[in-house]
């Protein structure tokens, strides 16, 4: 179950995890984007462009992910369902200029043993 | 009420150095992008450099390397250091306050919403 | 380089009529990131339009912006006295961060 006060878009299950989505104004060219758990950093991406324009990805926590032109997508096969966590998106803004780093969607997350039960189940 | 005053032009052999001075009053001036924008007499309007809130900086290939943009929240204050000037330099320089804020879905670029009365720079001999 | 190209360089127009103010950008830009500014002689700058059709604070409804990708236009639907001056347009973005146009007069004919 999905509780709090994000836009439930924010969370979705899949293959028997959450994909988290994090969006942004497609404006940005140049990214950070870290996703919290309370305050621990779950995942990190880093999006930069090159000369040619040849984009750059950097995933340090090696995360799964999904990259759109206004969204990032993170997906996490073991989320801690013993109690509710809040969950938010950073984002560092480097193109265009200037500097620009924003605490973006949140909400809680409260996930219940047989939710993930059934979702793995169908997964397998 | 939102206020840039400009100080610290004058006239300056090439080669010299000035530094200018804006003092900022009646906004959060640390939570606002800022630039310094020039105009020659009977000439356009010319972006000369900008700080970010984090003290990035940014310069046209005009200024890079003798401009130096700085600022000082605790005194509301925004510093221009102009070395090596030039003829070309001579301008009426404007301290402006720049405005945009970030959702997840949108870039809001308001502007340059606060305009100082500008202060005066001659590069002569 | 985003270059901004403004037309025409002088406008001269009688007070009641409608001027049209263009400005061309090099390649497309977002219309989020323009902006319009008057200036009248003596004065420093003002903020007109943002967004390219949003007016600013104070600005009258006889101002219009308009436009996307790399055509914008500033439109005047009936010229007062006061409106007779410098216009100039801008944009903000990566290369460079902030670039004007050249500005267009408007002058009463």
């Known amino acids: 179950e999905i509780n709090g006060s994000a836009d439930h878009r924010m969370f979705s299950f899949h293959n028997g995890g959450v994909q988290i989505s994090c969006k942004y104004p497609e404006t940005v060219q140049q990214l950070k984007m870290r996703l919290f758990r309370e305050r621990e950093v779950l995942c990190e991406l880093t999006k930069t462009k090159g000369s040619g324009n040849a984009v750059s990805i950097k995933n340090p926590m090696l995360c799964l992910y999904h990259l759109s032109n206004n969204s990032v997508s993170f997906f996490l096969n073991n989320p801690d369902s013993s109690q509710g966590s809040y969950y938010f998106c950073s984002l560092s803004i480097f193109d265009p200029p200037p500097f620009q780093e924003r605490n973006l969607s949140g909400g809680y997350l409260h996930i219940y043993e047989s939710q993930l039960c059934c979702q793995l189940k169908l997964w397998l | 009420e939102v206020q840039l005053v400009e100080s610290g032009g004058g006239l300056v052999q090439p080669g010299g150095s000035l530094r200018l001075s804006c003092a900022a009053s009646g906004f959060t001036f640390s939570s606002y992008d800022m630039h310094w924008v020039r105009q020659a007499t009977g000439k356009g309007l010319e972006w000369v450099s900008a700080?970010?809130?984090?003290?990035?900086?940014y310069y046209p290939g005009s200024v890079k390397g003798r401009f130096t943009i700085s600022r000082e929240n605790a005194k509301n204050s925004l510093y221009l250091q102009m070395n090596s000037l030039r003829a070309g330099d001579t301008a009426v320089y404007y301290c402006?306050?720049?405005?945009?804020?970030?959702?997840?879905?949108?870039?809001?670029?308001?502007?340059?919403?606060?305009w100082g009365q500008g202060t005066t720079v001659t590069v002569s001999s | 380089e985003i270059v901004l190209t403004q037309s025409p360089g002088t406008l001269s127009l009688s007070p009641g009529e409608r001027a049209t103010l263009s400005c061309r950008a090099s390649q497309s830009i977002s219309s989020s990131s323009l902006a319009w500014y008057q200036q009248k002689p003596g004065q420093a700058p003002g903020l007109l339009i943002f967004?390219?059709?949003s007016r600013a604070t104070g600005i009258p409804d006889r101002f219009s912006g308009s436009g996307s990708g790399t055509d914008f236009t500033l439109t005047i639907s009936r010229l007062e006295p006061e409106d007779f001056a410098v216009y100039y347009c801008?944009?903000?973005?990566?290369?460079?961060?902030?670039?004007f146009g050249q500005g267009t007069k408007l002058e009463i004919k």
């Open positions: 967004g390219a059709s």
């Open positions: 402006v306050r720049d405005k945009r804020t970030v959702t997840h879905e949108h870039y809001y670029y308001y502007g340059m919403d606060v």
């Open positions: 801008q944009q903000f973005g990566s290369s460079p961060m902030c670039s």
């Open positions: 700080i970010g809130t984090a003290g990035d900086t």
